[in-house]
């Protein structure tokens, strides 16, 4: 039940304006925030009790300003956070400490970005600096996607510092993308 929510609030240089599908899951690792914490709660459905079609992603719309250091977009952008229950809980209760263990095999369905869109934004900077034009890449839609166990394991490598300090009784939750990471991905549109 952890692994379901993906978030992409990174602003990235993109090849051209318009909508385009997600990169392959292997590439997705560095572009999403994979929240893998379960919370030590029992799975809410017996394993494999529902057809996958009965599960549904949530597409949550947020409005925010794009920032690059002290500069901020003149207008806010709207993007999606992908979150939701894409399949039955694939975790087994761990009798000690109410933790969770991964079921070792089988497909894993996750709610991840499906399509992205590019948007040109104008960044206004303090101190009379000239405005900067940028293109940003924003999540435009979400979908439940079947990922293999291999993808799960490869994503463990990207958990970062917080994985070393998991909260008591909970699976480690990866740290969100830092402002520095976002900043590095803001490129001049021209």
């Amino acid at each position: 039940q952890g692994w379901q929510a993906f978030k992409n609030d990174a602003t990235e240089i993109i090849p051209e304006l318009g909508e385009y599908p997600e990169p392959p899951p292997e590439l997705e690792n560095n572009k999403t925030m994979n929240r893998a914490e379960n919370g030590g709660r029992p799975p809410h459905h017996p394993f494999e009790t529902k057809d996958v079609s009965e599960y549904s992603c949530r597409e949550l719309h947020f409005t925010r300003y794009v920032t690059d250091g002290p500069c901020r977009s003149a207008k806010p952008v709207t993007e999606l956070v992908c979150s939701g229950q894409c399949g039955p809980a694939r975790l087994l209760p761990n009798a000690i400490g109410r933790g969770k263990w991964w079921r070792p095999s089988g497909p894993d369905f996750r709610c991840i970005p499906d399509r992205y869109r590019a948007q040109r934004v104008q960044l206004l900077c303090p101190g009379g600096e000239a405005p900067r034009a940028r293109k940003v890449r924003l999540v435009a839609s979400c979908k439940c996607k079947r990922l293999t166990r291999f993808h799960n394991q490869s994503e463990l490598k990207d958990f970062g510092t917080e994985a070393a300090r998991p909260q008591k009784g909970r699976k480690p939750r990866p740290r969100a993308r830092s402002a520095k990471a976002n900043q590095a991905e803001l490129e001049n549109a021209y």
Epitope: R35, S56, E59, E79, Q85
Partner: antibody, heavy 120, light 107 residues
Framework: QVQLQQSGAELVRPGTSVKVSCKAS????????IEWVKQRPGQGLEWIGV????????NYNERFKDKAALTADTSSSTAYMQLSSLTSDDSAVYFC?????????????WGQGTSVTVSS | DIQMTQTTSSLSASLGDRVTIRCRAS??????LNWYQQKPDGPVKLLIY???TLTSGVPSRFSGSGSGTDYSLTISNLDQEDIATYFC?????????FGSGTKLEIK
């Protein structure tokens, strides 16, 4: 343990504004949304809006678009809601709540509520 | 916006009774239905999330069920400490919306 500590009760004049705070502790602030909910005396719960503290992204209930402004300060793990142009209709208890959007898809921890009374 | 309807605003029952509180959404909410408990002048507490999952510490006499647009909360053996108002909430899409609440009282 997870806690959301809200600021104290406010008695304010009509036409003024008030800023309610919600200090989070016991978890990583940027990994959860903060939702705000209004409850008038003897009434139900009304969703005001949500902020994603990681990047300041917000979504407002249309009814509160011109009334509430949500912000978050990651350095102090505190979320704020500013209510402006107050009228007697704004007299209510305001709750902040944490949404675990990765596992629970619900508001799993709530603040104790802040009572705002608008009176001349 | 998705409307959430709790048709019963108050419900009177005896201790030990089995009580069911119903909630209807104006459109399919794909099981993103949560139940909250609020005791008089008290804080709000999440009881059940995603239709049927009990949060930690909630007694097993509470259960949730439903799908599509129709959901219910059942208390199998009513206890004095269950006297409260219960709200359903859809978490499928913004703006999140709550039912008007069902106040549970002892006969």
């Amino acid at each position: 343990q997870v806690q959301l500590q809200q600021s104290g009760a406010e008695l304010v004049r009509p036409g003024t504004s008030v800023k309610v705070s919600c200090k989070a502790s016991g978890y990583v602030f940027i990994n959860y949304f903060i939702e705000w909910v209004k409850q008038r005396p003897g009434q139900g719960l009304e969703w005001i809006g949500v902020i994603n503290p990681e990047n300041g992204g917000t979504n407002y209930n249309e009814r509160f678009k011109d009334k509430a402004a949500l912000t978050a300060d990651t350095s102090s793990s505190t979320a704020y809601m500013q209510l402006s142009s107050l009228t007697s209709d704004d007299s209510a208890v305001y709750f902040c709540a944490r949404e675990d959007y990765g596992d629970v898809y619900a508001m799993d921890y709530w603040g104790q509520g802040t009572s705002v009374t608008v009176s001349s | 916006d998705i409307q959430m309807t709790q048709t019963t605003s108050s419900l009177s029952a005896s201790l030990g009774d089995r009580v069911t509180i119903r909630c209807r959404a104006s459109q399919d909410i794909s099981n993103y239905l949560n139940w909250y408990q609020q005791k008089p002048d008290g804080p709000v507490k999440l009881l059940i999330y995603y239709t049927s999952t009990l949060t930690s510490g909630v007694p097993s006499r509470f259960s949730g069920s439903g799908s599509g647009t129709d959901y219910s909360l059942t208390i199998s053996n009513l206890d004095q400490e269950d006297i409260a108002t219960y709200f359903c909430q859809q978490g499928k899409t913004f703006p999140f919306t709550f039912g008007s609440g069902t106040k549970l009282e002892i006969k």
